[in-house]
């Protein structure tokens, strides 16, 4: 039975050229996190494996940094980075939990962080 919930940074915005931290947190479950995948649409950005640590996809190595924690830091943002990002938690014995973050990369300096929200 899956009892956990994923809390994410929700809808966020950041300035072009800047950086942003994508964060998800799994709570309300005692399940063991075996791996966390970060994806943009269906493109893999990075994997954090409990055994093996971080693996960053080669095409994102220059602009993606692991952490903090199980989060992911995107650097040198461009307008093309606007879109949906997903944290996918593989856990045992619960199974797979997914969190969604929408990032908007703005040309100007009016970027503000959106409210936090939860996805069951």
């Amino acid at each position: 039975m899956m009892t956990g919930t994923i809390e994410t940074t929700g809808n966020i915005s950041a300035e072009k050229g800047g950086s942003i931290i994508l964060q998800c947190h799994l709570s309300s479950t005692t399940a063991q996190v075996t791996q966390v995948n970060w994806e943009q649409q269906d493109q893999l950005l990075a994997i954090c494996n409990a055994d093996l640590g971080w693996h960053i996809s080669p095409s994102f190595k220059d602009r993606v940094a692991p952490g903090p924690g199980l989060g992911l830091t995107l650097q040198s943002l461009t307008v093309n980075d606007t879109g949906e990002y997903f944290c996918i938690y593989h856990t045992y014995p619960d199974g797979t939990y997914t969190g969604r973050i929408f990032l908007e990369v703005l040309e100007s300096s009016v970027a503000e962080h959106g409210a936090r929200f939860q996805i069951p």
Epitope: T34, L44, D51, L52, H55, T96, T98
Partner: antibody, heavy 119, light 107 residues
Framework: EVMLVESGGGLVKPGGSLKLSCAAS????????MSWVRQTPEKRLEWVAT????????YYPDSVKGRFTISRDNAKNTLYLQMSSLRSEDTALYYC????????????WGQGTSVTVSS | DIQMNQSPSSLSASLGDTITITCHAS??????LNWYQQKPGNIPKLLIY???NLHTGVPSRFSGSGSGTGFTLTISSLQPEDIATYYC?????????FGGGTKLEIK
């Protein structure tokens, strides 16, 4: 080329034990989560056990928990399945399989080794 | 455990046909659904992962769709080499479970 070659199957009496091996080549074995999956005589597929890349985490369905043990030797690029207290319902073709790095699906399977539990 | 019900259990079609195999999950599995192909006397091979993603080297005549509890595998322009049994598998929660298979034959 990714290759997975199972061995160790055979005929065993109910209550007996057997140890299966799977020799891996063509990829960085220690980076991949591995599983054993079996196919019954009726051709149904059943997940049997999973082990993480470093070997630190193992997972089983209730049907084999406490009877089967999955392990790996990354220095030898080999996956194992120790089976004990075998039952007739464990009769099957046992495959070892590699998971995608993303852990979404099993992308390569071995040819399988046959286990028959019968008196 | 999540039950995976595949239909039909067997299917006969002509070369060039478009066929659809369905897989129904007993509870919501989001997009965590994989399809495997097993040719006669051979081993299972991954076709589609995460409901709609074609695995490397799989011909584009194969496609997958669905989310939640209902999923489909579609093969367009059926070829002789597509004769096989097709299995769905859920990766949403443990224990991972497979459908009973759909045996595809050519008329």
């Amino acid at each position: 080329e990714v290759m997975l070659v199972e061995s160790g199957g055979g005929l065993v009496k109910p209550g007996g034990s057997l140890k299966l091996s799977c020799a891996a080549s063509g990829f960085t074995f220690s980076s991949y989560t591995m599983s054993w999956v079996r196919q019954t005589p009726e051709k149904r597929l059943e997940w049997v056990a999973t082990i993480s890349g470093g070997g630190g985490n193992t997972y089983y369905p209730d049907s084999v928990k406490g009877r089967f043990t999955i392990s790996r030797d990354n220095a030898k690029n080999t996956l194992y399945l120790q089976m004990s207290s075998l039952r007739s319902e464990d009769t099957a073709l046992y495959y070892c399989a590699r998971w995608l790095l993303t852990y979404y699906a099993m992308d390569y399977w071995g040819q399988g080794t046959s286990v028959t539990v019968s008196s | 455990d999540i039950q995976m019900n595949q239909s039909p259990s067997s299917l006969s079609a002509s070369l060039g046909d478009t066929i659809t195999i369905t897989c129904h999950a007993s509870q919501n599995i989001n997009v965590w659904l994989n399809w495997y192909q097993q040719k006669p006397g051979n081993i299972p091979k991954l076709l589609i992962y995460k409901a709609s993603n074609l695995h490397t080297g799989v011909p584009s005549r194969f496609s997958g769709s669905g989310s939640g509890t209902g999923f489909t595998l579609t093969i367009s322009s059926l070829q002789p080499e597509d004769i096989a049994t097709y299995y769905c598998q859920q990766g949403q929660s443990y224990p991972y479970t497979f459908g009973g298979g759909t045996k595809l034959e050519i008329k």
